[in-house]
Interface confidence: low
């Protein structure tokens, strides 16, 4: 006799209620299923300025109650508890985290930390986070976080000051370049020709600068793997989560196609800031010297 | 209730040597930074050192590498080893609890008088 | 390092009557992140050690009159007396602690 697939999937469905019990599926008795997770990324690092105030996240995902958690540095084989530091809990939907406030940052605060979670009688550690300290005497030609901010619009300061070879060869490159473009602008469908995710530009640009300065750039992302690292130029703040972003003129396409679409952008809309709001087109330039 | 009481202090000649002590109470010491702080007679304060609890040493370059803190857990001390001393180095000293980068100096004893003089 | 610079130096002042001391900053004290500002404002009365008023720029500490407040942000900051009183007498100074640890000169607040 064949067994129908109907049959089949009664005779599954009995094992899943059988083994119910004894997977720990259901909340039985208000007990919740779950574990405490850090979601410190392996070998992650922040490169940080002395002088400036950081706050190292410890991504802590559990379930009902909160774990006592702690950070502790890194001395050779021991971890020593950072006790008397100022540290805080930040709350989100579905992760919080134990933050550990350099205020500011010290040149020997340089070095391997870790946090670690107790619950239920059970010690959960995390993996090692490493901050490379730079000194504020070394760091004395780091131009301010104005003088970041206000990069995207020199090349228009410079524009009456003499740049009218500038202008025209821009014009040029530009003709060319829209020339070379409608020909693949047939290719694209017309939404996606028209709107670039921003925060899309502003990751990859993120990815590229990660090669080079070995530094994980991660905005919180589904696992909950959150890296920041304030010393990307400039730090901006949305609510309580920290962007960080990379310097305006580097890593990015020379021409970027975009219209404003701000539910694109969602919550790192202070990203484009800068930019007035028009629902048209526009160009990016970015011009290399 | 946190007591601080700093000891040590006294007359001394231009390029001698002094040790600066501050006992404390009603706390934990190895569980908070703290700081030394001078005031030059007639003048306003000036910061001199601060320890964290992790055991990290910070000094302002008037002071860096003629002055070390320090502490003994054990007695609940704080020290101040002083080298080199200089006539502006004249001061009341005053040992207290924060002080820190991020935390101002929240305890403070009643200091004592430090003396450079030939 | 950071500079504080204090003014006045000196401050007579009638009981009764507010007063207020200035202090400004050589770079921001605000920490973007926490909207914080690195900054705490002392009393010092004849013969004593220094005494915490506020910190945070605008919080009191605990036992500190509440005719004494802070304001301010960035790199200019005030404290005020809302009206002063002779205990109020003493050298006041402010402090940031958002890079290493500065103190302003120092303003002396006498009754006139």
């Known amino acids: 006799m064949k067994t129908l697939p109907a049959m089949l999937g009664t005779g599954k469905l009995f094992w899943v209620f059988f083994l119910i019990p004894y997977l720990d599926i259901w909340n039985i008795h208000g007990k919740e299923s779950c574990d405490v997770q850090l979601y410190i990324k392996r070998q992650s690092e922040h490169s940080i300025l002395a002088g400036d105030p950081f706050e190292l996240e410890c991504p802590v995902k559990y379930c009902a109650n909160r774990p006592h958690v702690t950070w502790c540095k890194l001395n050779g084989t021991t971890c020593v508890k950072l006790e008397d530091r100022q540290t805080s809990w930040k709350e989100e939907k579905n992760i919080s985290f134990f933050i550990l406030h350099f205020e500011p940052v010290l040149p020997n605060d340089n070095g391997s930390y870790r946090c670690s979670a107790n619950f239920q009688s059970n010690l959960i550690e995390s993996h090692s986070t490493t901050l490379y300290v730079t000194d504020v005497k070394s760091a004395s030609e780091r131009p301010s976080k104005d003088e970041m901010a206000s990069r995207p619009w020199l090349l228009y300061r410079l524009l009456p000051l003499g740049g009218l070879p500038l202008l025209i060869t821009t014009c040029f490159c530009l003709f060319c370049c829209l020339r070379r473009h409608q020909g693949k602008q047939n290719e694209l469908s017309d939404t996606a020709g028209r709107e670039i995710n921003l925060v899309d530009a502003h990751l990859k640009s993120e990815q590229t600068e990660a090669s080079t300065r070995q530094n994980s750039q991660v905005l919180l992302s589904e696992t909950g793997i959150y890296d920041n690292d304030p010393d990307l130029c400039f730090r901006m703040q949305e609510g309580s989560e920290v962007y960080s972003n990379p310097c305006l003129e580097e890593n990015k396409p020379g021409i970027v196609y975009a219209s404003l679409n701000h539910s694109v952008i969602g919550p790192n809309s202070r990203l484009a800031r800068n930019v007035k709001e028009a629902p048209t087109e526009y160009a990016s330039i970015c011009v290399r010297s | 209730e946190v007591q601080l009481v700093e000891s040590g202090g006294g007359l001394v000649k231009p390029g001698g040597s002094l040790r600066l002590s501050c006992a404390a109470s009603?706390?934990?010491?190895?569980?908070?930074?703290m700081s030394w702080v001078r005031q030059a007679p007639g003048k306003g304060l000036e910061w001199v050192a601060s320890?964290?609890?992790?055991?990290?040493?910070y000094y302002p370059d008037s002071v860096k590498g003629r002055f070390t803190i320090s502490r003994d857990n054990a007695k609940n001390s704080l020290y101040l080893q002083m080298s080199s001393l200089r006539a502006e180095d004249t001061a009341v000293y005053y040992c207290?609890?924060?002080?820190?980068?991020?935390?101002?100096?929240?305890?403070w004893g009643q200091g004592t008088t430090v003396t450079v003089s030939s | 390092d950071i500079v504080m610079t204090q003014s006045p130096l000196s401050l007579p002042v009638t009981p009764g009557e507010p007063a207020s001391i200035s202090c400004k900053s050589s770079?921001?004290?605000?920490?973007?992140?926490?909207?914080?500002?690195?900054l705490a404002w002392y009393q010092q009365k004849p013969g004593q050690s220094p005494q915490l008023l506020i910190y945070?720029?605008?919080t009191r500490d605990s036992g500190v009159p509440d005719r004494f407040s802070g304001s301010g942000s960035g790199t200019d900051f005030t404290l005020k007396i809302s009206r002063v009183e002779a205990e109020d007498v003493g050298v006041y100074y402010c402090?940031?602690?958002?890079?290493?640890?500065?103190f302003g000169g120092g303003t002396k607040v006498e009754i006139k």
């Open positions: 207290t609890r924060g002080g820190y980068y991020g935390s101002s100096p929240y305890y």
């Open positions: 009603g706390f934990t010491l190895s569980s908070y930074g």
């Open positions: 320890i964290r609890s992790d055991g990290n040493t």
């Open positions: 770079q921001s004290l605000l920490y973007s992140s926490n909207q914080k500002n690195y």
């Open positions: 945070w720029a605008s």
């Open positions: 402090q940031q602690y958002y890079n290493y640890l500065t």
